[in-house]
Amino acid sequence: MGKGDPKKPRGKMSSYAFFVQTCREEHKKKHPDASVNFSEFSKKCSERWKTMSAKEKGKFEDMAKADKARYEREMKTYIPPKGETKKKFKDPNAPKRPPSAFFLFCSEYRPKIKGEHPGLSIGDVAKKLGEMWNNTAADDKQPYEKKAAKLKEKYEKDIAAYRAKGKPDAAKKGVVKAEKSKKKKEEEDDEEDEEDEEEEEEEEDEDEEEDDDDE
């Protein structure tokens, strides 16, 4: 997070995070002096979440929506301190970062892994998918690599257009400066790539958990 910037808006919470928070508060009320075994507690929460109906989850989803709106509202007016570029506010209208070949592969085979091993944690599902990817012949990876390359190409065009649209005066400034900052920007983007993919993986898993319950 923002290395202790007190003005920085608190991060947005997912519906599941609100649910866990509620569970924790309930537990505290019932057992004010008991210490919590977190791995056991989160396992119980996860199990309970899976058995909840869409109606029961609705309350937490509303809380998450409201919190997302709050976060976006606060982020619009938030000015990070000088030098803090990591984890910038992401404009929801910005082109979405393209998935990697592995991420596309995971989208195909995650349902199977989760279906065959219903008790697996998100981490273990990812581990199994990693093994599966490693066991896949290079030739079979090609369709995913081709699609990922296509999406990357499209993203690069879209992001260039998006940046140009966002900075109408940019064209007036010298090209040399732009070239210098381009390399730095690419390095930052690469770091963000990994973070974004991890976030997307988690979001996708949460969505799937919710979909599973709706079936």
């Epitope: 093994e131 599966m132 896949t136 012949a137 290079a138 030739d139 079979d140």
Partner: antibody
Framework: EVQLLESGGGLVQPGGSLRLSCAAS????????MSWVRQAPGKGLEWVSR????????MYADSVKGRFTISRDNSKNTLYLQMNSLRAEDTAVYYC????????????????WGQGTMVTVSS | DIQMTQSPSSLSASVGDRVTITCRAS??????LNWYQQKPGKAPKLLIY???SLQSGVPSRFSGSGSGTDFTLTISSLQPEDFATYYC?????????FGQGTKVEIK
């Protein structure tokens, strides 16, 4: 019981079209890659086409590329092969096969096969 | 495309015999090799995957070995129901290719 059942074969003239179907049962169809494999009378096996679980990725043998189209309907547990511009050399028994992917270091294997449907291209 | 060559093309054997079929790939395919059995008028059946792993439900008299370019299918003691045609298939690259088959007949 895990089962694949092909249909749609028959006699067709050169240049004609045919659509094969393969109905899957006994397993979660939407989890698996599927393929078509054919066998000309008295000959060996020839892989034809493959489709990913979501249907988003497809592959074809050079001999059928541009003429055949593989597709699937996961809501109906059905695999299809649309065959256009048919030639005499396409005459074969067409098998639909389930493809088990990356389970081990050995990549993929056709672990479940249908009984096949005969396609005859002749004038 | 990777060429798969099986030998022999056919063989005659008796019940109880030990039978060995070989398969050679035109380039290294690591352990990306499967073996199938096909009886007349029937669909192929997976016997061995990943060169040496026995498919569930397949009798233990069937075994596979090899890696790289040379592979072997062995039937330790031939049974009456084993008279069929056997195919090797590489899963290393697209297009998937099969050997031409080895027909095991009764002596």
């Amino acid at each position: 019981e895990v089962q694949l059942l092909e249909s749609g074969g028959g006699l067709v003239q050169p240049g004609g079209s045919l659509r094969l179907s393969c109905a899957a049962s006994g397993f979660t169809f939407s989890w698996y890659d599927m393929s078509w494999v054919r066998q000309a009378p008295g000959k060996g096996l020839e892989w034809v086409s493959r489709i990913s679980p979501s249907g988003g990725y497809t592959m074809y043998a050079d001999s059928v590329k541009g003429r055949f189209t593989i597709s699937r309907d996961n809501s109906k547990n059905t695999l299809y092969l649309q065959m256009n511009s048919l030639r005499a050399e396409d005459t074969a028994v067409y098998y639909c096969a389930r493809l088990e992917v990356g389970a081990t270091s050995g990549g993929t294997a056709f672990d479940i096969w249908g009984q096949g449907t005969m396609v005859t291209v002749s004038s | 495309d990777i060429q798969m060559t099986q030998s022999p093309s056919s063989l005659s054997a008796s019940v109880g015999d030990r039978v060995t079929i070989t398969c050679r790939a035109s380039q290294s395919i690591s352990s990306y090799l499967n073996w199938y059995q096909q009886k007349p008028g029937k669909a192929p059946k997976l016997l061995i995957y990943a060169a040496s792993s026995l498919q569930s439900g397949v009798p233990s008299r069937f075994s596979g070995s090899g890696s790289g370019t040379d592979f072997t299918l062995t039937i330790s003691s031939l049974q009456p129901e084993d008279f069929a045609t056997y195919y090797c298939q590489q899963s290393y690259s697209t297009p998937r290719t099969f050997g031409q088959g080895t027909k095991v007949e009764i002596k």
